[in-house]
């Protein structure tokens, strides 16, 4: 197993609709054809898996149907979008990239993106 550099932004603010997007870029040392991308969340001394997708280079990123993540890939960049976020989901979101095929296996872990989520204030009742 070999190490690989992964870059991601330090901070992202989710939209008022609870959507956050960021780019995960990896320095591929070879010509990988099969790549696995996992988004992890670190909070309260625990790491949990948010979503994961395996894709063939040149093809679309496909997450499970019930996943809160969507994404697209372009070369060594993955554009990730996480939706349905609420204030309690604020935390450090880490991009983990694995080059699965062909060998050798490479593993890269980003430094994490701190995603801040602010729940929108409910609209006041209108007098009209």
């Amino acid at each position: 197993c070999k190490a690989m550099h992964v870059a991601q932004p330090a901070v992202v603010l989710a939209s008022s609709r609870g959507i956050a997007s960021f780019v995960c870029e990896y320095a591929s040392p070879g010509k990988a054809t099969e790549v696995r991308v996992t988004v992890l969340r670190q909070a309260d001394s625990q790491v949990t898996e948010v979503c994961a997708a395996t894709y063939m280079m040149g093809n679309e990123l496909t997450f499970l149907d019930d996943s809160i993540c969507t994404g697209t890939s372009s070369g060594n960049q993955v554009n990730l979008t996480i939706q349905g976020l609420r204030a309690m989901d604020t935390g450090l979101y880490i991009c983990k990239v694995e080059l699965m095929y062909p060998p050798p296996y490479y593993l890269g872990i980003g430094n994490g993106t701190q995603i801040y989520v602010i729940d929108p204030e409910p609209c006041p009742d209108s007098d009209f």
Partner: nanobody
Framework: EVQLVESGGGLVQPGGSLRLSCAAS????????IGWFRQAPGKEREEVSC????????NYADSVKGRFTISRDNSKNTVILQMNSLRAEDTGVYYC???????????????????WGQGTQVTVSS
């Protein structure tokens, strides 16, 4: 809150083997840096081995190199210390320790640990 629990200690003859296990209750050890320390009677506590959060890096004290092996079993949420060719000087209480580092340090062992188990006694004697 995560708690660490060691098991697998016991009495073994010189040259024998033991398999210590460090398990987490109340959470997981995923991506935690885990270390094993030991304290022999009348001696200071010393670090025996550690494994990084990714499992890519392992370190060993000179006194156990080639005899002890540390590994992660993420499916069982445990870290194993396999101890072979045990000697009388390996006798002591073995403690599992852990710390969740920043992701930038997941490939390294921790310099200090937040969490300590209660320890398990290992006695090597004929």
């Amino acid at each position: 809150e995560v708690q660490l629990v060691e098991s697998g200690g016991g009495l073994v003859q010189p040259g024998g083997s033991l398999r210590l296990s460090c398990a987490a209750s109340g959470g997981t050890l995923d991506y935690w840096s885990i270390g094993w320390f030991r304290q022999a009677p009348g001696k200071e506590r010393e670090e025996v081995s550690c494994i990084s959060g990714t499992g890519l890096r392992t370190n060993y004290a000179d006194s156990v190199k080639g005899r002890f092996t540390i590994s992660r079993d993420n499916s069982k949420n445990t870290v194993i210390l396999q101890m072979n060719s045990l000697r009388a000087e390996d006798t002591g209480v073995y403690y599992c320790t852990g710390k969740l580092l920043h992701p930038s340090l997941w490939s390294a062992c921790a310099n200090e640990y937040d969490l300590w188990g209660q320890g398990t006694q290992v006695t090597v004697s004929s």
